[in-house]
Structures are given as C-alpha cells and as structure tokens.
C-alpha cells in the first residue's frame, strides 16, 4: 500500500484518503459512494480482451 | 495490529438466550461493515448476520436459520459488535466468529467463542 | 440462495506438490470486471485467514505459491508448492449477494 504521490496503487485499486490505504475498486460495486471509487472509474481495469484496431 | 475479541459464549439450555460481543482494535471500525460467522463442531463455515454502517442506518441482514431470533448491533462509540441470541436451539452449537469487512471478503476475524445449547 | 459446491472434500498431498481446488457457484458470481468470489485458510482451532480476493487477488502478506483464477460459475484455488504450513481446510465464499455462502471445504492432508 502507497501514499499518494510516492507510487499508485496497484491495477484494479485505488487510493482512499478516508482509510489511508489502497482499495480494492471491486468494492465499489457493494459501496458506490466511497472516496476511492472516483479513482476506479477514471481508470477502468483492462477489458478481458485487448481489441486491436 | 487489527483484533477482534470475541465474549459471551458459553453453555445454555434450550430456548434460551446469550448475547455475544466483539471488542474491535487496529482499524477504522465505523468504516467497516461486520458479520458473525459460525462453525459447528467439525463443520463447514455458515454466515450467520451483518450489519453496515451508520450511512446505511445500520441496516441488517439475517441468514433464513436465525432470523427472528438473532440480532446483530454495534456501538461505534465503543467499537463493539453484538449478536443477541434468543429461542436457541441445539443446532445453534458452534464456534461464533466476529469478522469484519470493507466490503465482500471478510479481512479480519476474531478467535472464536463457543456457544453450547444443551439440557 | 447461491449454493457453492467444493471439490475435492479432501486430499492427500506431499510436500512441494501442485494442488488444485475447485469451487463451484450454482450462478455466476461475476460481472464483465470482477468476480465476487473470496478464499480462506483455516487450520486446525484457529480462526479462518483470507487468503485470496474477488477470484485472483492476493491479500497482503500472503506467499505467492498460492493463486487463484475463474470467473462465472467456476473458480480455482492452486499452490504451486505445498509446503508444511499449507496443510489446512481452504473455504471459498461469494459475495454476490445476501445470504453470503461458504463452500462445505477442502481439507489437505499429509500424503
């Protein structure tokens, strides 16, 4: 677990200032509003898929 | 350190009643949800009750097996978790954890404590 | 309810072996970015230890011998390399929805 601005949080979390820790964005689904979730729909996880143009 | 110390078990009668608590250290415990998970005696894990956080009115959610005769409470003032048990039966005999959760996967777990119901 | 359905119940292994568990969920537990699918490590008298978030995220602190995958319905539990302290009953839960459910286990012991 990172402080912001020393290194991001690994894919698929993001920061919570509240809880001071990196958290698992799948949580958002059951706790839409927490601060971190911001941080998961900016950077949605990589699809299962890679489509090539 | 995260800890989650369990009380109140012990030996009842039938129909009786028991209330467990869970004293909670180590991590913001108004910010996480809270769950009591049972095991009876050489068995599987079986969930029992949770109850979320004063943003949600400390709603609670009962497994079918002791709805209308559990209830979970907490006092964040106290970081405390109860599980009132009434009308008990010998099928309630278990090892009772408190767990604790931001959400989905239950991180933190207490010791245990042991509830017999028996005549 | 979602039923969860653990396989093997037990087995028997030695030390440095691949094992594998199963869990089955009677409907998906996933949508198209996560899986609400948890598992736990229980030794004998102690109380249950996480030891793998939504299908394949390891918790902090656990040893990277043990990984999990699946999506839908079916997931999996593997260590790569069972060692001493490993032997112990693995439980899988789902948090899709309430009531939260476990798999009946899967007990690992000494070969």
């Known amino acids: 677990e990172q402080a912001p601005g020393t290194a991001p949080c690994s894919r698929g979390s993001s920061w919570s200032a509240d809880l001071d820790k990196c958290m698992d964005c799948a949580s958002c689904r059951a706790r839409p509003h927490s601060d971190f979730c911001l941080g998961c729909a900016a950077a949605p996880p990589a699809p299962f898929r890679l489509l090539w143009p | 350190e995260v800890q989650l110390v369990e009380s109140g078990g012990g030996l009842v009668q039938p129909g009786g009643s028991l209330r467990l608590s869970c004293a909670a250290s180590?991590?913001?415990?108004?910010?996480?949800?809270m769950s009591w998970v049972r095991q009876a005696p050489g068995k599987g894990l079986e969930w029992v009750a949770e109850?979320?956080?004063?943003?949600?009115?400390?709603?609670?959610h009962y497994a079918e097996s002791v709805k209308g005769r559990f209830t979970i409470s907490r006092d964040d003032s106290k970081n405390s978790l109860y599980l009132q048990m009434n009308s008990l039966r010998a099928e309630d005999t278990a090892v009772y954890y408190c767990?604790?959760?931001?959400?989905?996967?239950?991180?933190?777990w207490g010791q245990g404590t042991l509830v017999t119901v028996s005549s | 309810d979602i039923q969860m359905t653990q396989s093997p119940s037990s087995l028997s292994a030695s030390v440095g072996d691949r094992v594998t568990i199963t869990c089955r969920a009677s409907?998906?537990?996933?949508?198209?970015?996560?899986?609400?699918m948890h598992w736990y490590q229980q030794k004998p008298g102690k109380a249950p230890k996480l030891l793998i978030k939504?299908?394949?995220n390891l918790e902090s602190g656990v040893p990277s011998r043990f990984s999990g995958s699946g999506s839908g319905t079916d997931f999996t539990l593997t260590i790569s390399s069972l060692q001493p302290e490993d032997f112990a009953t693995y439980y899988c839960?789902?948090?899709?929805?309430?009531?939260?459910?476990f798999g009946g286990g899967t007990k690992v012991e000494i070969k």
């Open positions: 767990t604790g959760y931001y959400a989905d996967a239950m991180d933190y």
């Open positions: 180590g991590f913001t415990f108004s910010s996480y949800w």
């Open positions: 109850i979320r956080l004063k943003s949600d009115n400390y709603a609670t």
């Open positions: 409907q998906s537990v996933s949508t198209s970015s996560y899986s609400y």
């Open positions: 939504y299908a394949s």
């Open positions: 839960q789902h948090s899709w929805e309430i009531p939260y459910t």
